[in-house]
């Protein structure tokens, strides 16, 4: 992983996935039925980071099917008209308005399962998803602010003598870069792409002859990754014995 110029010794250090993000469903156990929901207008909003290319299942409030009149999913994606998917129990009818993304579907038929699935999650699925369950006692809502996460590609190379460049390419949100040991670093550069991803670039220099290997550590919501590289010799240096 990563790229290196031919005169560099580049090593992958760490690739740890944050498995809290691997979960593709926030659905509650449907047995946890709200016992006494009479006259209560329940509204729950959940911020949910989901990794791109995974599948996601979004759930409605746990309302008993016999109490339902209509289930509506309202989907608001950036730069698109609001899409609604609804199911009327009485007539067993489903209806869609302004819904063009075939990756966003009911998990099964709405009379069997009111959950919504995104299969697979794409970067364009950032947005707000709300399930509205209409019952004789009122409307029950569950909303999701879906944040699509994109794992950055990490590269490390030595651009010139004892100056290393670490890049976290096309991550969402922007990654953070740190170094071991600390070097003399230029301000971190960020390049924003039209799809919402960000490339972060850190360039550092190490003057000390005693620094052998530098490690670039990239922190991101999808997990952390580190690369390390042995620095080239100081130009003109031949022999040393603990030059520090």
């Amino acid at each position: 992983e990563g790229a290196a110029q031919s005169n560099n010794s580049l090593m992958l250090q760490t690739s740890k996935e944050n498995h809290t993000l691997a979960s593709n469903s926030l659905c509650m156990d449907e047995k946890q039925i709200t016992q006494n929901h009479s006259k209560v207008l329940a509204e729950v909003n959940i911020s949910w980071p989901v990794q791109m290319a995974r599948n996601a299942v979004l759930c409605c409030p746990p309302i008993e099917f016999r109490n339902l009149i209509v289930i509506t999913w309202e989907i608001i994606l950036r730069g698109q008209p609001s899409c609604t998917k609804s199911y009327r129990k009485e007539t067993n009818e489903t209806k869609e308005t302004n819904c063009t993304d075939e990756r966003i579907t009911w998990v099964s038929t709405p009379d069997q399962n009111s959950d919504l699935q995104i299969h697979p999650v794409a970067i364009t699925h950032d947005g707000y998803y709300r399930c509205i369950m209409a019952t004789p006692d009122g409307n029950f809502h569950r909303g999701y602010h879906l944040q699509v996460l994109v794992t950055p590609e990490v590269t490390l190379f030595e651009s010139r003598n004892r100056t290393a460049v670490c890049k976290a390419v096309a991550g969402k949100p922007a990654a953070q870069i740190s170094w071991i040991p600390a070097g003399d670093c230029a301000p971190t550069e960020q390049e924003y792409w039209g799809n919402g991803t960000v490339t972060v670039k850190s360039t550092c220099h190490w003057e000390g002859h005693n620094v052998s290997t530098v490690t670039c550590h990239v922190s991101h919501l999808t997990g952390n990754k580190s690369l390390y590289i042995e620095l080239l010799p100081v130009p003109g240096a031949k022999k040393s014995a603990k030059l520090y």
Epitope: S6, N7, N8, S9, M11, L12, Q13, T14, K16, I180, P181, A182, H209, N210, V211, S212, T213, V214, T215, S226, Y228, I229, E230, L232, P233, V234, A237, K238, K239, S240, K242
Partner: antibody, heavy 114, light 107 residues
């Protein structure tokens, strides 16, 4: 796959010198630091120094300064470690390693005995 | 020089037990390190590179964690073939320095 092939065991008298070789294959020889580590019988591991074959740049640990010489022959992709003024406490297995310490040779036993 | 303090120096553990070895860098200086296993008459074998990256072909019962100055090497369920001496190596600064080793024996 990087391979490091070291020269055979040596028996030397105190005061003599020994030259251990390490031939590398499977990577760009001139682009990677080569390190030397030694291990006395029943003891831990001790870093001696390193050499960058691309430029001949060298770092020696001060403990060995003046007694150790590391060289590289780019035509044969071989590095050498020469230790002079040998004493009994230099009896050890000498290892070469590269790729930031992730690839090691099998070691060369140097015995210093009168 | 960066001194690597490795502990314990030896331990005797039963098969199936969890084993934890630590290495600490002196002077509060952040470093990066490898973990090696060495059996008598053999060259050290790299198990964990860069503090936590399991090397190819190494059983998943071995793991490494930590960053900065404090690092931990763990064997989740000790096997008979794990009897060996284990070393950490800091490779951030010259001179590279090893921990003094941990000799692991099976009860």
């Amino acid at each position: 796959q990087v391979q490091l092939v070291q020269s055979g065991a040596e028996v030397k008298k105190p005061g003599a010198s020994v030259k251990v070789s390490c031939k590398a294959s499977g990577h760009t020889f001139t682009s990677y630091w080569m390190h030397w580590v030694r291990q006395a019988p029943g003891q831990g591991l001790e870093w001696m120094g390193n050499i960058y074959p691309g430029s001949g740049s060298i770092n020696y640990d001060e403990k060995f300064q003046g007694r150790v010489t590391m060289t590289a022959d780019t035509s044969t992709s071989t590095v050498y470690m020469e230790l002079s003024s040998l004493r009994s406490e230099d009896t050890a297995v000498y290892y070469c390693l590269t790729m930031t310490g992730t690839s090691w040779g099998r070691g060369t036993l140097v015995t210093v005995s009168s | 020089d960066i001194q690597m303090t490795q502990s314990p120096s030896s331990l005797s553990v039963s098969v199936g037990d969890r084993v934890t070895i630590t290495c600490q860098a002196s002077q509060g200086t952040p470093i990066n390190l490898h973990w090696f296993q060495q059996k008598p008459g053999k060259a050290p074998k790299l198990l964990i590179s860069g503090a936590s990256n399991l090397e190819s072909g190494v059983p998943s019962r071995f793991s490494g964690s930590g960053s900065g100055t404090e690092f931990t090497f763990t064997i989740s369920s000790l096997q008979p073939e794990d009897a060996a001496t284990y070393y950490c190596l800091q490779f951030t600064y010259i001179p590279w320095t090893f921990g003094q080793g941990t000799k692991l024996e099976i009860k």
